[in-house]
Amino acid sequence: ESALITQQDLAPQQRAAPQQKRSSPSEGLCPPGHHISEDGRDCISCKYGQDYSTHWNDLLFCLRCTRCDSGEVELSPCTTTRNTVCQCEEGTFREEDSPEMCRKCRTGCPRGMVKVGDCTPWSDIECVHKESGTKHSGEVPAVEETVTSSPGTPASPCSLSG
């Protein structure tokens, strides 16, 4: 895999503790689940549950596993080759333009609008104008009707970081 994981903290410098397996680089790079030694001669395994690497690399450190924030559930744990997958709790969602936090879904649509999409871990409820069918911008309305959203949909990752 050639995906680059961005904005991840580095794990502390790894000095090849005895339990960390070593192997030789292949064509100068190390496989997923490893990082390269300072002299470039060895591949050192990442530590399960602590750090990871997702692709062939010449990283000097494995990448530190993400810890799910409060308000998030862990969909899958961190392995040596994949970061933790976190998802917003039911009734909350994470927007692309504010990925750092889960926000509460609205409980209903403004007057003159109808709900066409439920609250999911990655989107608020979706409202459209009754007549025109155009989408609502997403601001929380001053007055809400009694139309309410159903709880979040079944588990599906909203921000895959690995």
Partner: antibody, heavy 119, light 106 residues
């Protein structure tokens, strides 16, 4: 003497494609991990792609992933960068670069080739 | 990504001056820092790697120091050929560069 000579740059429209080449000499090309690094008009340097010495493994930053492909022909001592879906922000001087022995960073760079993405 | 904050962005100095350029990493990078010199229209040239090791042929007036997050490039006595742009780079996690320092003649 290590020599890296890039070619293939030019003016291309947004959404267009371009293939850069880098001819290597003065060292055993097939033994080295190679990369492309670019320098924007504002002089900022950005790593673009890396390929293993034998060409089997590659990796990229998110900014170019899925649009750029690095490859090499060790028989011809040549490194390539295939660029597609080009954007204005891809405008830069593109350098091919060699990863040094036992230092895990770039020790030699080519002179660069200018890619301008504009309509 | 690890951000490398380089300062100053430019400086004016005279031949014989001692010049210091600093780079601050947004997180610990150990000693995985390199320094490059670039002259107009030319490729960057490696000066220092592993924070303090001089590359082959680099004069000993160039000295690198630091570890963790704070790094320094010092030119002990500036020579006419040293007026150029200088960049730091971390290579512990992928590759990111500082914004550069332009060393100009006073």
């Amino acid at each position: 003497e290590v020599m890296l000579v890039e070619s293939g740059g030019g003016l291309v429209q947004p959404g267009g494609s371009l293939r850069l080449s880098c001819a290597a000499s003065g060292f055993t090309f097939s033994s080295y991990v190679m990369s492309w690094v670019r320098q924007t008009p504002e002089k900022r340097l950005e790593w673009v792609a890396t390929i293993s010495s034998g060409g089997s493994y590659t990796y990229y930053p998110d900014s170019v992933k899925g649009r750029f492909t690095i490859s090499r022909d060790n028989a011809k001592n040549t490194l390539y960068l295939q660029m597609s879906s080009l954007r204005a922000e891809d405008t830069a001087v593109y350098y091919c670069a060699r990863r040094g022995d036992s230092m895990i960073t770039t020790d030699y760079w080519g002179q660069g080739t200018l890619v301008t993405v504009s309509s | 990504d690890i951000v490398m904050t380089q300062s100053p962005s430019s400086l004016s100095a005279s031949v014989g001056d001692r010049v210091t350029i600093t780079c601050k990493a947004s997180q610990d990078v150990g000693t995985a820092v390199a320094w490059y010199q670039q002259k107009p229209g030319k490729a960057p040239k490696l000066l220092i790697y592993w924070a303090s090791t001089r590359h082959t042929g680099v004069p000993d007036r160039f000295t690198g120091s630091g570890s963790g997050t704070d790094f320094t490039l010092t030119i002990s006595s500036l020579q006419p050929e040293d007026f150029a742009d200088y960049f730091c780079q971390q290579y512990s996690s992928y590759r990111t560069f500082g914004g550069g320092t332009k060393v100009e003649i006073k």
